[in-house]
Amino acid sequence: QNASRGRRQRRMHPNVSQGCQGGCATCSDYNGCLSCKPRLFFVLERIGMKQIGVCLSSCPSGYYGTRYPDINKCTKCKVDCDTCFNKNFCTKCKSGFYLHLGKCLDSCPEGLEANNHTMECVSIVHCEASEWSPWSPCMKKGKTCGFKRGTETRVRDILQHPSAKGNLCPPTSETRTCIVQRKKCSKGERGKKGRERKRKKLNKEERKETSSSSDSKGLESSIETPDQQENKERQQQQKRRARDKQQKSVSVSTVH
Protein backbone atom coordinates (compact mmCIF):
# COMPACT_ATOMS: atom_id res chain seq x y z
CA GLN A 1 0.00 0.00 0.00
CA ASN A 2 2.13 2.99 1.17
CA ALA A 3 5.24 1.01 0.35
CA SER A 4 4.78 0.91 -3.41
CA ARG A 5 3.88 4.61 -3.52
CA GLY A 6 7.08 5.47 -1.63
CA ARG A 7 9.21 3.31 -3.92
CA ARG A 8 7.68 4.82 -7.08
CA GLN A 9 8.46 8.35 -5.91
CA ARG A 10 12.02 7.40 -5.06
CA ARG A 11 12.59 5.74 -8.43
CA MET A 12 11.50 8.85 -10.28
CA HIS A 13 13.83 11.10 -8.26
CA PRO A 14 16.72 12.22 -10.49
CA ASN A 15 19.43 11.64 -7.85
CA VAL A 16 18.33 8.11 -6.98
CA SER A 17 20.81 5.42 -7.94
CA GLN A 18 20.29 1.66 -8.06
CA GLY A 19 24.05 0.92 -7.93
CA CYS A 20 24.33 1.37 -4.18
CA GLN A 21 26.80 -0.02 -1.66
CA GLY A 22 26.63 -1.32 1.91
CA GLY A 23 23.20 -2.94 1.98
CA CYS A 24 21.28 -0.10 0.30
CA ALA A 25 18.50 -1.06 -2.10
CA THR A 26 18.16 2.53 -3.35
CA CYS A 27 20.32 5.53 -2.56
CA SER A 28 21.18 9.10 -3.50
CA ASP A 29 24.49 10.96 -3.64
CA TYR A 30 23.25 13.51 -1.12
CA ASN A 31 21.24 11.39 1.38
CA GLY A 32 22.99 8.00 1.20
CA CYS A 33 20.66 5.01 1.53
CA LEU A 34 16.98 5.64 0.88
CA SER A 35 15.86 2.02 1.31
CA CYS A 36 17.53 -1.20 2.40
CA LYS A 37 17.94 -4.74 1.16
CA PRO A 38 15.71 -7.35 2.83
CA ARG A 39 16.08 -7.75 6.62
CA LEU A 40 18.45 -4.78 6.96
CA PHE A 41 17.47 -1.88 9.20
CA PHE A 42 17.34 1.70 8.01
CA VAL A 43 18.78 4.35 10.32
CA LEU A 44 19.43 8.05 9.78
CA GLU A 45 22.86 9.21 10.91
CA ARG A 46 23.46 12.89 11.46
CA ILE A 47 26.67 14.16 9.88
CA GLY A 48 27.00 17.87 10.52
CA MET A 49 23.86 19.47 9.15
CA LYS A 50 23.12 16.49 6.92
CA GLN A 51 21.20 13.27 7.66
CA ILE A 52 22.57 10.24 5.87
CA GLY A 53 20.63 6.99 5.50
CA VAL A 54 22.53 3.84 6.47
CA CYS A 55 21.50 0.16 6.25
CA LEU A 56 22.59 -2.13 9.08
CA SER A 57 22.04 -5.77 10.02
CA SER A 58 21.12 -4.66 13.54
CA CYS A 59 20.39 -1.30 15.11
CA PRO A 60 23.17 0.61 16.88
CA SER A 61 23.33 1.13 20.65
CA GLY A 62 20.50 3.36 21.83
CA TYR A 63 18.18 2.18 19.04
CA TYR A 64 15.84 -0.75 18.50
CA GLY A 65 14.58 -2.26 15.25
CA THR A 66 10.98 -2.55 14.07
CA ARG A 67 9.93 -4.36 10.91
CA TYR A 68 7.14 -2.58 8.99
CA PRO A 69 5.80 -3.74 5.63
CA ASP A 70 7.58 -0.93 3.78
CA ILE A 71 10.68 -0.40 5.91
CA ASN A 72 12.74 -2.00 8.67
CA LYS A 73 13.43 0.98 10.86
CA CYS A 74 15.75 1.78 13.77
CA THR A 75 13.99 3.85 16.40
CA LYS A 76 15.72 5.69 19.25
CA CYS A 77 15.32 4.31 22.76
CA LYS A 78 14.27 6.84 25.40
CA VAL A 79 16.94 9.44 26.24
CA ASP A 80 18.05 7.78 29.50
CA CYS A 81 18.20 4.29 27.96
CA ASP A 82 21.21 2.59 26.41
CA THR A 83 19.63 -0.63 25.15
CA CYS A 84 15.93 -1.35 24.72
CA PHE A 85 13.49 -3.85 23.27
CA ASN A 86 11.05 -1.07 22.43
CA LYS A 87 9.93 2.28 23.85
CA ASN A 88 8.27 0.58 26.81
CA PHE A 89 11.07 -1.75 27.86
CA CYS A 90 14.59 -0.55 28.49
CA THR A 91 17.05 -3.36 29.21
CA LYS A 92 20.12 -1.25 30.09
CA CYS A 93 20.12 2.33 31.31
CA LYS A 94 22.63 5.06 30.60
CA SER A 95 25.23 5.85 33.27
CA GLY A 96 23.73 7.36 36.43
CA PHE A 97 20.30 5.76 35.94
CA TYR A 98 18.83 2.66 37.55
CA LEU A 99 16.63 0.14 35.74
CA HIS A 100 13.25 -0.55 37.32
CA LEU A 101 10.34 -2.29 35.56
CA GLY A 102 11.85 -1.50 32.17
CA LYS A 103 12.20 2.21 32.98
CA CYS A 104 15.30 4.25 33.85
CA LEU A 105 15.19 6.22 37.11
CA ASP A 106 17.74 8.56 38.67
CA SER A 107 16.91 7.10 42.10
CA CYS A 108 15.10 3.99 43.23
CA PRO A 109 11.53 4.08 44.58
CA GLU A 110 10.81 3.65 48.28
CA GLY A 111 11.26 0.08 49.47
CA LEU A 112 13.92 -0.62 46.85
CA GLU A 113 17.64 0.01 46.78
CA ALA A 114 20.15 0.65 44.03
CA ASN A 115 22.48 -2.19 43.05
CA ASN A 116 25.52 -0.33 41.75
CA HIS A 117 26.90 -3.39 39.97
CA THR A 118 23.84 -4.20 37.87
CA MET A 119 22.53 -0.60 37.97
CA GLU A 120 19.08 -1.91 38.85
CA CYS A 121 16.60 -1.17 41.60
CA VAL A 122 16.28 -4.29 43.73
CA SER A 123 14.24 -5.29 46.76
CA ILE A 124 15.80 -4.57 50.15
CA VAL A 125 16.84 -7.86 51.75
CA HIS A 126 16.82 -8.07 55.55
CA CYS A 127 19.01 -10.40 57.58
CA GLU A 128 17.47 -13.73 58.47
CA ALA A 129 18.85 -15.93 61.23
CA SER A 130 17.95 -19.47 62.23
CA GLU A 131 16.63 -20.45 65.66
CA TRP A 132 19.20 -20.82 68.43
CA SER A 133 20.79 -24.22 68.79
CA PRO A 134 20.37 -25.92 72.20
CA TRP A 135 22.93 -24.83 74.83
CA SER A 136 26.11 -26.86 74.64
CA PRO A 137 27.09 -29.00 77.67
CA CYS A 138 28.57 -27.00 80.57
CA MET A 139 32.33 -27.31 80.10
CA LYS A 140 35.63 -26.07 81.40
CA LYS A 141 38.76 -26.54 79.34
CA GLY A 142 36.86 -28.93 77.15
CA LYS A 143 35.87 -31.10 80.14
CA THR A 144 32.45 -31.60 81.67
CA CYS A 145 33.74 -32.70 85.11
CA GLY A 146 35.78 -31.63 88.10
CA PHE A 147 35.06 -27.91 88.18
CA LYS A 148 32.30 -25.84 89.67
CA ARG A 149 32.23 -23.16 87.05
CA GLY A 150 32.26 -23.50 83.28
CA THR A 151 30.69 -22.01 80.19
CA GLU A 152 28.00 -23.12 77.82
CA THR A 153 27.40 -21.77 74.34
CA ARG A 154 24.63 -21.73 71.78
CA VAL A 155 24.83 -20.66 68.14
CA ARG A 156 22.62 -19.82 65.19
CA ASP A 157 23.20 -19.54 61.45
CA ILE A 158 22.71 -16.59 59.13
CA LEU A 159 20.19 -17.87 56.58
CA GLN A 160 20.09 -14.66 54.54
CA HIS A 161 22.72 -11.92 54.57
CA PRO A 162 21.22 -8.42 54.29
CA SER A 163 21.56 -6.09 51.34
CA ALA A 164 23.04 -2.59 51.80
CA LYS A 165 19.85 -1.12 53.28
CA GLY A 166 18.68 -4.29 55.01
CA ASN A 167 18.43 -4.85 58.77
CA LEU A 168 21.73 -5.84 60.37
CA CYS A 169 22.27 -9.40 61.51
CA PRO A 170 21.83 -10.30 65.20
CA PRO A 171 24.58 -12.06 67.24
CA THR A 172 25.34 -15.54 65.97
CA SER A 173 26.58 -16.96 69.28
CA GLU A 174 25.93 -16.53 73.00
CA THR A 175 28.03 -17.73 75.93
CA ARG A 176 27.11 -17.82 79.61
CA THR A 177 28.73 -19.16 82.76
CA CYS A 178 27.28 -22.30 84.24
CA ILE A 179 27.85 -24.77 87.04
CA VAL A 180 29.49 -27.98 85.97
CA GLN A 181 27.81 -31.15 87.23
CA ARG A 182 29.55 -32.25 90.46
CA LYS A 183 31.38 -35.41 89.52
CA LYS A 184 34.98 -36.52 89.78
CA CYS A 185 37.01 -36.68 86.62
CA SER A 186 38.29 -40.06 85.61
CA LYS A 187 42.12 -40.33 85.56
CA GLY A 188 42.43 -39.27 81.94
CA GLU A 189 40.24 -36.21 82.48
CA ARG A 190 41.88 -34.83 85.71
CA GLY A 191 43.30 -31.29 85.72
CA LYS A 192 46.08 -29.89 87.99
CA LYS A 193 45.76 -31.09 91.62
CA GLY A 194 44.02 -28.94 94.11
CA ARG A 195 43.63 -25.95 91.85
CA GLU A 196 39.89 -26.06 92.12
CA ARG A 197 39.96 -26.14 95.95
CA LYS A 198 41.84 -22.85 96.12
CA ARG A 199 39.37 -21.14 93.86
CA LYS A 200 37.17 -18.50 95.44
CA LYS A 201 33.40 -18.72 95.17
CA LEU A 202 31.73 -17.17 92.15
CA ASN A 203 30.96 -13.45 92.32
CA LYS A 204 27.38 -12.47 91.66
CA GLU A 205 28.57 -10.61 88.57
CA GLU A 206 30.30 -13.71 87.24
CA ARG A 207 27.09 -15.69 87.49
CA LYS A 208 25.31 -13.28 85.19
CA GLU A 209 24.58 -14.48 81.65
CA THR A 210 26.95 -12.96 79.10
CA SER A 211 25.87 -12.34 75.54
CA SER A 212 28.24 -11.63 72.66
CA SER A 213 27.57 -8.62 70.50
CA SER A 214 27.12 -8.79 66.72
CA ASP A 215 29.17 -7.12 64.07
CA SER A 216 27.40 -5.11 61.43
CA LYS A 217 26.68 -7.88 58.93
CA GLY A 218 26.30 -10.98 61.07
CA LEU A 219 29.85 -12.32 60.93
CA GLU A 220 30.62 -14.70 63.82
CA SER A 221 30.96 -12.63 67.00
CA SER A 222 34.06 -13.20 69.14
CA ILE A 223 33.42 -15.10 72.39
CA GLU A 224 35.66 -16.01 75.33
CA THR A 225 36.57 -19.67 75.11
CA PRO A 226 36.94 -21.78 78.29
CA ASP A 227 40.75 -21.71 77.72
CA GLN A 228 40.76 -17.92 77.64
CA GLN A 229 38.74 -17.79 80.85
CA GLU A 230 41.18 -20.23 82.51
CA ASN A 231 44.16 -18.08 81.46
CA LYS A 232 42.51 -14.98 82.89
CA GLU A 233 41.99 -16.66 86.23
CA ARG A 234 45.60 -17.87 86.27
CA GLN A 235 46.84 -14.33 85.60
CA GLN A 236 44.66 -12.93 88.38
CA GLN A 237 46.05 -15.52 90.82
CA GLN A 238 49.63 -14.62 89.84
CA LYS A 239 48.89 -10.91 90.39
CA ARG A 240 47.48 -11.65 93.84
CA ARG A 241 50.61 -13.65 94.77
CA ALA A 242 52.86 -10.87 93.53
CA ARG A 243 50.92 -8.31 95.56
CA ASP A 244 51.23 -10.47 98.69
CA LYS A 245 55.04 -10.79 98.16
CA GLN A 246 55.39 -7.05 97.69
CA GLN A 247 53.56 -6.32 100.93
CA LYS A 248 55.86 -8.74 102.85
CA SER A 249 59.05 -7.27 101.46
CA VAL A 250 57.91 -3.74 102.18
CA SER A 251 57.23 -4.56 105.84
CA VAL A 252 60.66 -6.19 106.20
CA SER A 253 62.48 -3.22 104.72
CA THR A 254 60.84 -0.84 107.16
CA VAL A 255 62.28 -2.81 110.11
CA HIS A 256 65.83 -2.22 108.87
Epitope: N2, T66, R67, N86, N88
Partner: antibody, heavy 116, light 107 residues
Protein backbone atom coordinates in the same frame (compact mmCIF):
# COMPACT_ATOMS: atom_id res chain seq x y z
CA UNK B 1 -0.40 4.30 35.01
CA UNK B 2 -1.13 3.47 31.36
CA UNK B 3 -4.85 3.39 30.56
CA UNK B 4 -6.63 2.66 27.29
CA UNK B 5 -10.41 2.89 27.22
CA UNK B 6 -12.35 1.80 24.13
CA UNK B 7 -15.87 2.95 23.28
CA UNK B 8 -18.28 2.96 20.34
CA UNK B 9 -19.08 -0.75 20.11
CA UNK B 10 -22.60 -2.06 19.66
CA UNK B 11 -24.95 -4.06 17.47
CA UNK B 12 -25.03 -3.07 13.81
CA UNK B 13 -26.53 -4.50 10.63
CA UNK B 14 -24.33 -5.88 7.86
CA UNK B 15 -23.20 -3.20 5.42
CA UNK B 16 -23.52 -0.43 8.04
CA UNK B 17 -20.75 1.60 9.71
CA UNK B 18 -19.41 2.06 13.22
CA UNK B 19 -16.65 4.22 14.67
CA UNK B 20 -14.62 3.00 17.62
CA UNK B 21 -12.61 5.33 19.86
CA UNK B 22 -9.80 4.65 22.30
CA UNK B 23 -8.90 7.27 24.91
CA UNK B 24 -5.30 6.99 26.10
CA UNK B 25 -3.73 8.31 29.30
CA UNK B 26 -0.70 7.74 31.53
CA UNK B 27 1.90 7.83 28.73
CA UNK B 28 3.07 10.08 25.89
CA UNK B 29 0.53 8.99 23.30
CA UNK B 30 2.25 10.82 20.42
CA UNK B 31 5.41 8.69 20.91
CA UNK B 32 3.71 5.36 20.29
CA UNK B 33 2.49 3.32 17.35
CA UNK B 34 -1.06 2.18 18.10
CA UNK B 35 -3.10 -0.78 16.90
CA UNK B 36 -6.50 -2.43 16.92
CA UNK B 37 -6.64 -6.16 17.66
CA UNK B 38 -9.88 -8.14 17.62
CA UNK B 39 -11.13 -11.41 19.04
CA UNK B 40 -14.21 -13.18 17.68
CA UNK B 41 -16.32 -14.98 20.33
CA UNK B 42 -14.50 -18.13 21.47
CA UNK B 43 -11.68 -17.55 18.96
CA UNK B 44 -8.10 -16.32 18.97
CA UNK B 45 -6.49 -12.89 18.62
CA UNK B 46 -6.27 -11.17 15.24
CA UNK B 47 -4.32 -8.01 14.42
CA UNK B 48 -6.50 -5.54 12.48
CA UNK B 49 -4.57 -2.31 11.85
CA UNK B 50 -1.65 -0.18 13.03
CA UNK B 51 -0.93 3.52 12.77
CA UNK B 52 2.55 4.88 13.44
CA UNK B 53 3.20 7.47 16.15
CA UNK B 54 2.72 10.58 13.96
CA UNK B 55 -0.14 9.20 11.87
CA UNK B 56 1.87 9.33 8.64
CA UNK B 57 1.71 5.60 7.88
CA UNK B 58 -1.03 3.01 8.36
CA UNK B 59 -1.11 -0.78 7.91
CA UNK B 60 -4.10 -3.14 7.65
CA UNK B 61 -4.82 -6.84 7.49
CA UNK B 62 -6.00 -7.88 4.03
CA UNK B 63 -9.58 -8.70 5.06
CA UNK B 64 -10.29 -5.13 6.25
CA UNK B 65 -8.32 -3.12 3.67
CA UNK B 66 -10.54 -0.58 1.94
CA UNK B 67 -13.29 -0.96 4.55
CA UNK B 68 -11.58 0.07 7.81
CA UNK B 69 -9.61 3.25 8.47
CA UNK B 70 -7.34 3.71 11.49
CA UNK B 71 -6.59 7.30 12.54
CA UNK B 72 -5.43 9.25 15.55
CA UNK B 73 -5.67 12.68 17.12
CA UNK B 74 -2.51 13.23 19.15
CA UNK B 75 -3.85 16.51 20.57
CA UNK B 76 -6.75 14.54 22.10
CA UNK B 77 -4.75 11.37 22.95
CA UNK B 78 -7.33 9.37 21.02
CA UNK B 79 -7.17 6.50 18.53
CA UNK B 80 -10.02 5.75 16.12
CA UNK B 81 -11.21 2.89 13.93
CA UNK B 82 -13.76 3.78 11.29
CA UNK B 83 -15.45 0.54 10.17
CA UNK B 84 -17.53 0.63 7.00
CA UNK B 85 -19.34 -2.12 5.06
CA UNK B 86 -19.41 -4.30 8.15
CA UNK B 87 -19.78 -8.07 7.75
CA UNK B 88 -20.90 -10.83 10.10
CA UNK B 89 -17.28 -12.03 10.33
CA UNK B 90 -16.28 -8.65 11.81
CA UNK B 91 -18.20 -9.57 14.98
CA UNK B 92 -15.63 -9.49 17.79
CA UNK B 93 -14.31 -7.72 20.85
CA UNK B 94 -12.09 -4.91 19.55
CA UNK B 95 -9.08 -3.97 21.66
CA UNK B 96 -6.84 -0.96 21.20
CA UNK B 97 -3.22 -1.51 22.16
CA UNK B 98 0.20 0.09 22.00
CA UNK B 99 2.03 -1.65 19.15
CA UNK B 100 5.80 -1.58 19.30
CA UNK B 101 6.69 -5.04 17.95
CA UNK B 102 4.65 -6.52 20.80
CA UNK B 103 1.27 -5.32 22.07
CA UNK B 104 2.38 -4.07 25.46
CA UNK B 105 -0.67 -2.27 26.85
CA UNK B 106 -4.27 -3.15 26.09
CA UNK B 107 -7.68 -1.62 26.70
CA UNK B 108 -10.53 -3.64 28.18
CA UNK B 109 -12.15 -4.03 24.73
CA UNK B 110 -15.46 -3.04 23.16
CA UNK B 111 -17.89 -5.55 21.62
CA UNK B 112 -18.98 -5.13 18.00
CA UNK B 113 -21.83 -7.38 16.83
CA UNK B 114 -22.74 -7.41 13.15
CA UNK B 115 -26.12 -9.05 12.79
CA UNK B 116 -29.29 -8.61 10.79
CA UNK C 1 1.56 -14.29 6.00
CA UNK C 2 3.50 -16.24 8.62
CA UNK C 3 1.35 -18.95 10.25
CA UNK C 4 1.89 -19.81 13.91
CA UNK C 5 0.61 -23.20 15.04
CA UNK C 6 0.31 -23.87 18.76
CA UNK C 7 0.09 -27.30 20.31
CA UNK C 8 -1.74 -28.60 22.12
CA UNK C 9 -4.95 -26.59 21.55
CA UNK C 10 -6.04 -27.43 25.07
CA UNK C 11 -4.37 -29.02 28.03
CA UNK C 12 -5.53 -30.29 31.44
CA UNK C 13 -3.04 -30.14 34.29
CA UNK C 14 -2.84 -29.95 38.08
CA UNK C 15 -1.35 -27.38 40.42
CA UNK C 16 2.38 -28.09 40.74
CA UNK C 17 2.68 -29.69 37.29
CA UNK C 18 5.33 -28.71 34.77
CA UNK C 19 3.66 -27.65 31.53
CA UNK C 20 5.08 -27.01 28.04
CA UNK C 21 3.28 -25.29 25.16
CA UNK C 22 4.84 -25.23 21.71
CA UNK C 23 4.55 -22.70 18.89
CA UNK C 24 5.73 -23.52 15.37
CA UNK C 25 6.22 -20.83 12.69
CA UNK C 26 5.67 -21.50 8.98
CA UNK C 27 9.01 -19.80 8.26
CA UNK C 28 12.07 -18.56 10.13
CA UNK C 29 11.14 -15.75 12.52
CA UNK C 30 14.57 -15.66 14.23
CA UNK C 31 13.90 -14.64 17.85
CA UNK C 32 11.00 -12.27 17.14
CA UNK C 33 8.45 -14.11 19.27
CA UNK C 34 6.30 -13.13 22.25
CA UNK C 35 3.91 -14.97 24.57
CA UNK C 36 0.66 -13.64 26.08
CA UNK C 37 -1.69 -14.86 28.79
CA UNK C 38 -5.43 -14.20 28.60
CA UNK C 39 -8.04 -14.90 31.24
CA UNK C 40 -11.78 -15.06 30.43
CA UNK C 41 -13.34 -11.62 29.90
CA UNK C 42 -9.95 -9.87 30.17
CA UNK C 43 -7.46 -8.37 27.74
CA UNK C 44 -4.32 -10.36 26.96
CA UNK C 45 -1.22 -9.67 29.03
CA UNK C 46 2.31 -9.74 27.62
CA UNK C 47 4.50 -12.29 29.47
CA UNK C 48 7.63 -12.82 27.35
CA UNK C 49 9.30 -11.05 24.42
CA UNK C 50 12.31 -11.95 22.25
CA UNK C 51 11.65 -15.67 22.93
CA UNK C 52 12.90 -15.72 26.53
CA UNK C 53 12.87 -12.21 28.05
CA UNK C 54 10.43 -12.07 30.93
CA UNK C 55 8.32 -8.95 31.43
CA UNK C 56 8.92 -7.40 34.86
CA UNK C 57 6.54 -8.77 37.44
CA UNK C 58 5.95 -12.05 35.60
CA UNK C 59 6.89 -14.96 37.93
CA UNK C 60 10.12 -16.79 37.16
CA UNK C 61 8.24 -20.09 36.82
CA UNK C 62 7.45 -18.88 33.28
CA UNK C 63 10.21 -19.32 30.72
CA UNK C 64 10.57 -19.33 26.96
CA UNK C 65 12.99 -21.00 24.59
CA UNK C 66 13.62 -21.81 20.93
CA UNK C 67 14.69 -20.02 17.76
CA UNK C 68 13.96 -20.05 14.05
CA UNK C 69 10.67 -21.91 13.72
CA UNK C 70 10.20 -23.89 16.95
CA UNK C 71 9.45 -22.26 20.29
CA UNK C 72 8.22 -23.34 23.71
CA UNK C 73 6.63 -21.72 26.73
CA UNK C 74 7.25 -23.62 29.96
CA UNK C 75 5.55 -23.18 33.32
CA UNK C 76 7.75 -25.02 35.81
CA UNK C 77 5.20 -25.46 38.59
CA UNK C 78 1.60 -24.54 37.81
CA UNK C 79 -0.17 -22.20 40.22
CA UNK C 80 -3.96 -21.74 40.42
CA UNK C 81 -3.70 -18.29 38.79
CA UNK C 82 -1.92 -19.75 35.72
CA UNK C 83 -5.02 -21.45 34.32
CA UNK C 84 -5.74 -19.33 31.24
CA UNK C 85 -5.29 -19.27 27.47
CA UNK C 86 -1.79 -18.66 26.10
CA UNK C 87 -0.93 -17.14 22.70
CA UNK C 88 2.34 -16.81 20.82
CA UNK C 89 2.88 -13.82 18.49
CA UNK C 90 5.54 -13.13 15.87
CA UNK C 91 6.76 -9.63 15.03
CA UNK C 92 9.37 -10.54 12.44
CA UNK C 93 7.01 -9.80 9.57
CA UNK C 94 3.81 -7.91 8.80
CA UNK C 95 1.10 -8.75 9.38
CA UNK C 96 2.06 -9.59 12.97
CA UNK C 97 0.29 -12.88 13.61
CA UNK C 98 -0.83 -14.85 16.66
CA UNK C 99 -1.05 -18.57 17.28
CA UNK C 100 -4.59 -19.97 17.68
CA UNK C 101 -4.10 -20.27 21.44
CA UNK C 102 -3.64 -23.03 24.03
CA UNK C 103 -6.28 -23.32 26.74
CA UNK C 104 -4.81 -24.52 30.01
CA UNK C 105 -7.46 -26.05 32.26
CA UNK C 106 -7.52 -27.56 35.76
CA UNK C 107 -7.49 -31.36 35.73
Amino acid sequence: EVQLVESGGGVVQPGRSLRLSCAASGFTFSDYDMAWVRQAPGKGLEWVATIIYDGSRTYYRDSVKGRFTISRDNSKNTLYLQMNSLRAEDTAVYYCATHDKTFDYWGQGTMVTVSS
Amino acid sequence: DIQLTQSPSSLSASVGDRVTITCRASEDIYSDLAWYQQKPGKAPKLLIYDVNSLIHGVPSRFSGSGSGTDFTLTISSLQPEDFATYYCQQYDNYPNTFGQGTKLEIK
